[in-house]
Interface confidence: low
């Protein structure tokens, strides 16, 4: 038996369902009683889901997995993973045994879009050209870790004194805080771009300083 999976990683958004595709070519006269199908985590060999002895043995993985029982006889051994979490990310092995056996691994890449950045300015009043200010750009609940870029009003990169920290919460999603310390010009726009490298999603925030008042 030959097992086939998609070579490209499956990208799934957090809290959505993902299908890990796996198929095999059953021979004529194939019966489900002959099938031993095992899904497991590639690295740890932890059992995820199985079908043996002609029946679905169910989920061994957080009760969030399911097969497509009506399609098994046609050779569709795909696995449905419900309500995807960051901790689901990784490689899953589809193992099929009939008379002989084969296996193949499929990667699950989990992603979550970052929120529109919120911008704060410190100090935020009585500002004059030449003052040193701290601009903080905060974006929340994304995955994987973001790439953060600062740009000026002309779209040119600001590579000065930038400190970026990313902290995972209990769901594994990242909160990004990027701090730019800059000397004010007469006026100017400071933009922060938070990019999700998997989704190729850009979230933008900016602050414009034109004497008084500031606009966000």
């Amino acid at each position: 038996v030959e097992v086939q999976v998609s070579e490209d990683p499956v990208v799934a958004l957090v809290d959505t369902d993902a299908t890990l595709r796996c198929s095999f070519s059953p021979e004529p006269g194939f019966s489900l009683r002959q099938l031993n199908l095992i899904w497991q985590l590639t690295d740890t060999k932890q059992l995820v889901h199985s079908f043996t002895e002609g029946r679905d043995q169910g989920s061994a993985y957080a009760n969030r997995t399911a097969l497509f029982p009506d399609l098994l006889v046609q050779g569709n051994a795909s696995l449905r993973l419900q309500r995807v979490r960051v901790t689901d990310e990784g490689s899953y092995t589809c193992f099929v045994s009939i008379q002989d056996f084969d296996s193949a691994a499929v990667s699950l890449q989990v992603a979550a879009p970052y929120s529109k950045p919120s911008m704060t300015l410190e100090p935020n009043k009585d500002l004059r050209p030449g003052d040193m200010v701290t601009i903080t750009c905060s974006s929340y609940q994304g995955y994987p870790e973001a790439e953060v870029f600062w740009k000026d009003g002309q779209g040119l990169p600001l590579t000065g004194n930038v400190t970026t920290s990313q902290m995972a919460n209990e769901r594994g999603l990242f909160d990004v805080h990027s701090v730019l310390r800059v000397v004010l010009g007469a006026n100017g726009t400071y933009s922060c771009l938070v990019r999700n490298p998997v989704l190729q999603q850009d979230a933008h925030g900016s602050v414009t300083i034109t004497g008084q008042p500031m606009t966000f």
Partner: antibody, heavy 121, light 107 residues
Framework: QVQLVESGAEVKKPGSSVKVSCKAS????????ISWVRQAPGQGLEWMGR????????NYAQKFQGRVTITADKSTSTAYMELSSLRSEDTAVYYC??????????????WGQGTLITVSS | DIQMTQSPSTLSASVGDRVTITCRAS??????LAWYQQKPGKAPKLLIY???SLQSGVPSRFSGSGSGTEFTLTISSLQPDDFATYYC?????????FGQGTRLEIK
């Protein structure tokens, strides 16, 4: 029921390093976070940092940044905490802890038995 | 870092008493607060999480309340087994921080 078993007590010289292990059983180790918390004699609890094994992400308290390294080996369900440049104030009981199955990663319903590290010349 | 301040540092009470321990955060932590009990030579034991949720297996005489910056742990009727040191812990932001502890002793 998660069980956390730590390595044994050690006596170390100032300036040296120590590596404490914490072996987990009874749960899906890689899905959880393992934190390290220390307690100096007669003192309170102090969080040092944590790792999420499945993500390979560690976070440290600023106080220990650069001196502590937390790692995890998924294959053996073991977390490690290495503290370098030891000084006498590092004499403490070091605990590993985690949140188990259903609670937050940051509240600790399972604790190791504690490892006493004594730093003395 | 968020500072957690417990009061009192030491509390003398008798079996059957109702006792309250207070924990103050230096800034708002919403309800992300836990309470632990620790006995000498033992690891801490989780009593309360998310300010007021009772951990499984913990007697109902323990209760927690509060949000923002002010929190309390109440033991409705002290039992001999309750004499120990109690710690609050915030998990609103890194680094996780604990209060300095409240030692509950027999009067």
């Amino acid at each position: 029921q998660v069980q956390l078993v730590e390595s044994g007590a050690e006596v170390k010289k100032p300036g040296s390093s120590v590596k404490v292990s914490c072996k987990a059983s009874g749960g899906t180790f890689s899905s959880y976070a393992i934190s390290w918390v220390r307690q100096a004699p007669g003192q309170g609890l102090e969080w040092m940092g944590r790792i999420i094994p499945i993500l390979g992400i560690a976070n440290y308290a600023q106080k220990f940044q650069g001196r502590v390294t937390i790692t995890a080996d998924k294959s053996t369900s073991t977390a490690y905490m290495e503290l370098s440049s030891l000084r006498s104030e590092d004499t403490a009981v070091y605990y590993c802890a985690n949140g188990g199955d259903s609670s937050s990663w940051y509240t600790f319903d399972y604790w190791g038995q504690g490892t006493l590290i004594t730093v003395s010349s | 870092d968020i500072q957690m301040t417990q009061s009192p540092s030491t509390l003398s009470a008798s079996v059957g008493d109702r006792v309250t321990i207070t924990c103050r955060a230096s800034e708002t932590i919403s309800s992300w607060l836990a309470w632990y009990q620790q006995k000498p030579g033992k690891a801490p034991k989780l009593l309360i999480y998310k300010a007021s949720s009772l951990q499984s297996g913990v007697p109902s005489r323990f209760s927690g309340s509060g949000s923002g910056t002010e929190f309390t742990l109440t033991i409705s009727s002290l039992q001999p087994d309750d004499f120990a040191t109690y710690y609050c812990q915030q998990y609103y932001s890194y680094p996780i921080t604990f209060g300095q502890g409240t030692r509950l002793e027999i009067k």
